[in-house]
């Protein structure tokens, strides 16, 4: 467990000309407010996805009136951080939304509105419990300047948040296998050992031996989907057994989300999955133009020419999102043929393909045989992308280039002795077993397991392996 | 190394249709986006339209209703067909490759002059 | 569409002095997505800068460009005997994709 943490530096127009007009104005003051949203970054979640690390809204920040004539300056921010708990191991790669918030203090009806200024989003690689990481993005002509950092809330340590540690018991030393927790040296490292049976995927623990549940499992080893379709109510009282959660009135009761956004309970909240088009705590903005800029990693704005028309972004190969905000992992998609190992470049996917394939997807089957001999009468065999000899009998090796010693093997069992013979190998047998490698006892009355060996064979005979 | 290699007739009469192929090689096409330009000396450099394997096509609204690029995977290869020319539509016609990092052209062809004349 | 007007059409300087290219758009050009390229007669343009500022690769690095918002740079910061060509911007932030008429750069 732990908290992610962001710090908003200033907000205002970039660098260079075109300036922004002031988002306020004398008639219409105005007041800034931020909202983060945390998605871990390796997920293959949409991106319109919930915010599966969190989110977060800040305070509003103090009204601002625009002084006539003079240009957009840097806004007056709200205090404090915008923090995120997290309750699980911090993923160390997370992908991030932060969007600007003006709230209009004019004399509205139904209080102050609300509409989206900025909106970035980035994808970024963080160890908790290191330094603040400092960050700049752009969103059309506005600048945002911010730093962040992850930490861990005691006593979880560690890059990720998934250490223990404990005050120690001894004064001078850990106990056994255990180190002091940098940098809390009075401190040990804890094991951490959940529940036995807790189930790796769904559930957790802060202390050892608990089993905690991930949302949307229940049961004393989180292997229960939480189900409302076996409750008395669908909000019925919260069993373990049946796996009915989610006592009293929901917050997505009556949907919250306007447009045509769909609604989805978080552990604080709820959060609204917009339709393309629209954003806002509630889908209620409209009106993003490919003006704004919304198309992020050389993402190409296609359409949007006015609020009315919706934009889409075509995504440079590697990057994926409505707002091509989200890293592909095109390996994933195993596009490698034959066994082929996928390396994703970055611009390109390359694959290294098995012996015997070849191709930009290791889809050619290579002929095997082609060109290769085999020696000694042997014959070519293809198979698993390398060709391989069958070779005639007395040769062996790669190419059957090599005379094989039939007897190296030691194919006759029971302490019988093998010589070699021009057809193969012939087994003399040691007293009580018969057969082409000894393989059978005879039994005491003279009768064997088998049928009688063959005409002119006695047992104990040498049995020739043809 | 990337090389592009345009071809198609250089002469193509009015209200008939302009077809060009690219062929790339030392290069897959299934990895990137691959864009028509073409430039004539009264309009400069145009960007035509471009291609992403065979499901995503954009092109400019200008010529959009008169466009249709399409690739050849199996045989490394992109086409523009370009319908009911006018002298207006001669034109050197280049092929190009779009960047990794944005819509940017980081591999052209040669480019082939198409004259539009009866 | 997002309209790209180059200035001057024509620029006339002698080899070993600064050249300063530039390129002004009609509207924002989204994050910085403005691309320079040099065309020699004959052949087709060469990408040189993405980004507004990122060298391609094989670009010397006399070849910079900076900028942001609607107004861009080209600087070439020692002129050589090859640099006098023609020179385009390029953006690519939205569709559809438009160029600029081009700076003529040629010797004094």
């Known amino acids: 467990a732990g908290v992610f943490e962001l710090q908003i530096h200033s907000f205002g127009p970039g660098p260079g000309p075109g300036a922004p007009r002031s988002p306020c104005s004398a008639r219409l003051p105005c007041r800034l407010f931020f909202r983060v949203c945390l998605k871990p970054g390796l997920s293959e979640e949409a991106a319109e996805s919930p915010c599966a690390l969190g989110a977060a809204l800040s305070a509003r920040g103090p009204v601002y009136t625009e002084q006539p004539g003079a240009p957009a300056p840097d806004l007056p921010l709200p205090d404090g951080l915008l923090q995120v708990p997290f309750r699980d191991a911090w993923p160390g790669t997370f992908s991030f939304i932060i969007e600007t918030w003006r709230e209009e203090l004019g004399d509205q009806i139904g209080g102050p509105a609300w509409s989206l200024l900025a909106r970035v989003a980035g994808r970024r690689r963080l160890a908790a419990g290191g330094p603040w990481a400092r960050d700049i993005q752009r969103a059309g002509a506005w600048e945002l300047r911010f730093s962040y950092r992850a930490r861990c809330e005691p006593p979880a340590v560690g890059t990720a948040c998934t250490r223990l540690c404990r005050p120690r018991s001894a004064p001078s030393r850990c106990g056994p296998g255990l180190r002091p927790c940098a940098p809390l040296e009075d401190e040990c490292e804890a094991p951490l050992v959940c529940r036995a049976g807790c189930s790796p995927e769904h559930g957790f623990c802060e202390q050892p031996g608990e089993c905690r549940c991930l949302e949307g499992w229940t049961g004393p080893l989180c292997t229960v989907p939480v189900s409302t379709s076996s409750c008395l109510s669908p909000r019925g009282p919260s069993s373990a057994t049946t796996g009915c959660l989610v006592p009293g009135p929901g917050p997505c009761d009556g949907n919250p989300c306007a447009n045509g956004g769909s609604c989805s309970e978080t552990p604080r909240s709820f959060e609204c999955t917009c339709p393309r088009g629209f954003y806002g705590l509630r889908c209620e903005v409209s009106g993003v133009t490919c003006a704004d800029g919304p198309c992020f990693n050389g993402g190409l704005c296609v359409g949007g020419a006015d609020p009315d028309s919706a934009y889409i972004c075509h995504c440079p190969p590697g990057f994926q999102g409505s707002n091509c905000e989200k890293r592909v992992d095109r390996c994933s998609l195993q596009p490698c043929r034959n066994g082929g190992l996928c390396l994703d470049l970055g611009h390109a996917l390359r694959c290294r393909c098995r012996a015997g394939f070849a191709g930009p997807r290791c889809e050619h089957d290579l002929d095997d045989c082609a060109g290769r001999a085999c020696a000694n009468g042997g014959t070519c065999v293809e198979g698993g992308g390398a060709h391989r000899c069958s070779c005639a009998l007395g040769f062996g090796g790669r190419d059957c280039r090599e005379r094989a010693d039939p007897c190296a093997a030691r194919p006759c069992a029971h302490g019988g002795r093998c010589y070699a013979h021009f057809s193969g190998l012939v087994c003399a047998c040691a007293p009580g077993y018969m057969g082409a490698r000894c393989e059978f006892p005879v039994h005491p009355d003279g009768a064997s397991a088998l049928p009688a060996a063959p005409p002119g064979l006695r047992p104990g005979d040498p049995q020739r392996y043809l | 190394q990337v090389q592009l290699q345009e071809s198609g007739p250089g002469l193509v009469k009015p209200s008939e249709t302009l077809s060009l192929t690219c062929t790339v090689s030392g290069g897959s096409i299934s990895s990137y986006y691959w864009s028509w330009i073409r430039q004539s000396p009264g309009k400069g450099l145009e960007w035509i339209g471009y291609v992403y394997y065979s499901d995503i096509t954009n092109y400019n609204p200008s010529l959009k209703s008169r466009v249709t690029i399409s690739v050849d995977t199996s045989k490394n290869q992109f086409s523009l067909n370009l319908n009911s020319v006018t002298a207006a539509d001669t034109a050197f016609y280049f092929c190009?490759?779009?960047?990794?990092?944005?819509?940017?052209?980081?591999?052209w062809g040669q480019g082939t002059l198409v004259t539009v004349s009866s | 569409e997002i309209v790209l007007t180059q200035s001057p059409d024509t620029l006339s300087l002698s080899p070993g002095e600064r050249a300063t290219l530039s390129c002004r758009a009609s509207q924002s050009v989204s994050r910085r997505y403005l691309a320079w390229y040099q065309q020699k007669p004959g052949q087709a343009p060469r990408l040189l800068i993405y980004?507004?500022?990122s060298r391609a690769t094989g670009i010397p690095d006399r070849f910079s460009g900076s900028g942001s918002g609607t107004d861009f740079t080209l600087t070439i910061s020692r002129l050589e005997p090859e640099d006098f060509e023609v020179y385009y911007c390029q953006q690519y932030g939205t569709s559809p994709i438009t160029f600029g008429q081009g700076t003529r750069l040629e010797i004094k």
């Open positions: 980004g507004a500022s």
């Open positions: 190009a490759r779009i960047g990794v990092a944005g819509f940017y052209f980081d591999y």
